[in-house]
């Protein structure tokens, strides 16, 4: 009688993460008597995946009724596959004894797992920066397999070229991560701009995955100030306005100084928004000319988004 053979017909099996993998194994004879065990890997460090005789293997089910006496099909199904399950699986026949001894192994089936990349996460600088400055954005995506992946950066639909990308680890692994850093030069018009990181992978049936960052969270556009004297309202009163233009974000505090002394402080509230996302605001000060004998230096001092104050002055002539 021919000696028992352990047949694993599939050299390799590929499965999508989250699915089940079926690993086929049949034996050609019922003799010798003894159980079948499945291992991942070979040698002393091999990992037991399934033991027909004993043990609890919650993710493994037998494809046929392996408890039947005449059964020769020892195929198994492993549920909820993850990249960590990749490897070569061996179906091994044991001879019954005390203890059971290994009799013959199948040639092995290599299980390869394809896994989608996670949604890319884009993060910008911790502190805001002003126009003309270069800022860095990072994009990360994890858990994909195989290793091949493409990553592109866009600013408002225009592809960026100044970036560096790494896929880790460099060698063989069950899954991979990608990390990319892009440099972006800010402009005054960038409040409404978006930076997009786009990741394409063989497993993606839809369009590439996208992560976005709004430059509104990164940019600070400092205000321009203009102080003007309005026509006299009443005989002794002059209206002076301070136009605060094109600033972002909205957080702004304005202080009026008369000859260096604080006259009034207010916080920007009813601002108007420009098309580019920046804000304008106007503050006015009513100066009683009759209270001053000499010329008055009026200063509009603005503290924007916690930055050092900027100011603009206006000399008010007091005619004798």
């Amino acid at each position: 009688e021919e000696e028992l053979q352990v047949i694993q017909p599939d050299k390799s099996v590929s499965v999508a993460a989250g699915e089940s993998a079926i690993l086929h194994c049949t034996v050609t004879s019922l003799i010798p008597v003894g159980p079948i065990q499945w291992f991942r890997g070979a040698g002393p460090a091999r990992e037991l995946i399934y033991n027909q005789k004993e043990g609890h293997f919650p993710r493994v089910t037998t494809v046929s009724e392996s408890t039947k006496r005449e059964n020769m099909d020892f195929s198994i199904s492993i549920s909820n596959i993850t990249p960590a399950d990749a490897g070569t699986y061996y179906c091994v026949k044991f001879r019954k004894g005390s203890p059971d001894t290994e009799f013959k192994s199948g040639a092995g089936t290599e299980l390869s797992v394809r896994a989608k990349p996670s949604a890319p996460v884009v993060s910008g600088p911790a502190a805001r920066a002003t126009p003309q400055h270069t800022v860095s954005f990072t994009c990360e995506s994890h858990g994909f397999s195989p290793r091949d992946i493409t990553l592109k950066w866009f600013k408002n639909g225009n592809e960026l070229s100044d970036f560096q990308t790494n896929v880790d680890p460099v060698g063989e692994s069950v899954s991979y991560s990608i990390h990319s850093t892009a440099k972006v030069v800010l402009t005054r018009e960038d409040v409404h701009s978006q930076v997009i990181c786009e990741v394409a992978h063989v497993t993606l049936q839809g369009d590439p995955l996208r992560g976005t960052a709004n430059l509104s969270e990164t940019i600070r556009v400092p205000p321009t100030l203009e102080v003007t004297q309005q026509p006299v309202r009443a005989e002794n009163q002059v209206n002076v306005t301070c136009q605060v233009r094109k600033f972002y974000p909205q957080r702004l505090q304005l202080t009026w100084l008369e000859n260096g002394n604080v006259s009034r402080t207010e916080t920007a509230s009813t601002v108007t928004e420009n098309k580019d996302g920046t804000y304008n605001w106007m503050s006015w000060l009513l100066v009683n000319v009759s209270a001053h004998r000499d010329d008055v230096k009026l200063t509009c001092q603005v503290e924007h988004d916690g930055q050092p104050a900027v100011s603009k002055s206006h000399d008010l002539k007091v005619s004798a």
């Epitope: 590929s14 394409a200 063989v202 497993t203 049936q205 839809g206 369009d207």
Partner: antibody, heavy 116, light 109 residues
Framework: VQLVESGGRLVQPGTPLTLSCTVS????????MGWFRQAPGKGLEYIGI?????SPYYASWVNGRFTISKTSTTMDLKMNSLRSEDTATYFC?????????????WGPGTLVTVSS | DIQMTQSPSSLSASVGDRVTITCRAS??????LAWYQQKPGKAPKLLIY???FLYSGVPSRFSGSGSGTDFTLTISSLQPEDFATYYC???????????FGQGTKVEIK
């Protein structure tokens, strides 16, 4: 799971034509789909794909001559100003469940003949 | 664009023969290569994907190997139903485009 192409016929050069691929047994919103063609006695040629979310991508030679679109159960290939060299059997196909690098389900094809 | 060069363009073989068809890519496509079988008047049928994975329901006499630029389809023992034309198809993960080889016709000797 089935794909069936339709719309192929004899047309004169310069005429537009739209081919349809009707799917059953799966959802077009879950898979990338592709169009291919094969001129008589020649090899297979890739035309373009449409992603599960509806974005089309084309082979570099297409140059705007063809447009791929889809509804919930059909994928269309709109061909403008046909030429004699467009005479071919046109196939639609679905990519595999593991990824977009291969096509595991194909329709039987529909023949387009461009001749005056 | 990537070019795929298949060889031979045709071959004659007998039932039971071992048949090998090769496909070479003009640049690396890693393992993104599929093999199809096509019979006259029919649609292509997938045999192998990812260079070496046998598609469900395909007889085990078909096998694929290779990675990078050089790939092989092997039929270990040719059967009467295997007389057909075979195509390789690449997918390039950067351009996300597909290219076919020109085909290999396997005829009865």
């Amino acid at each position: 799971v089935q794909l069936v192409e339709s719309g192929g016929r004899l047309v004169q050069p310069g005429t537009p034509l739209t081919l349809s691929c009707t799917v059953s047994g799966f959802s077009l919103s879950s898979y990338v789909m592709g169009w291919f063609r094969q001129a008589p006695g020649k090899g297979l040629e890739y035309i373009g794909i449409i992603s599960s979310s509806g974005s089309p991508y084309y082979a570099s030679w297409v140059n705007g001559r063809f447009t791929i679109s889809k509804t919930s159960t059909t994928m269309d290939l709109k061909m403008n100003s046909l030429r004699s060299e467009d005479t071919a059997t046109y196939f639609c196909a679905r990519v595999g469940p593991l990824g977009v690098d291969y096509f595991n389900i194909w329709g039987p094809g529909t023949l387009v003949t461009v001749s005056s | 664009d990537i070019q795929m060069t298949q060889s031979p363009s045709s071959l004659s073989a007998s039932v039971g023969d071992r048949v090998t068809i090769t496909c070479r890519a003009s640049q690396s496509i890693n393992s993104y290569l599929a093999w199809y079988q096509q019979k006259p008047g029919k649609a292509p049928k997938l045999l192998i994907y990812s260079a070496s994975f046998l598609y469900s329901g395909v007889p085990s006499r078909f096998s694929g190997s290779g990675s990078g630029t050089d790939f092989t389809l092997t039929i270990s023992s040719l059967q009467p139903e295997d007389f057909a034309t075979y195509y390789c198809q690449s997918w390039h993960y950067i351009s996300r485009s597909y290219t076919f080889g020109q085909g290999t016709k396997v005829e009865i000797k």
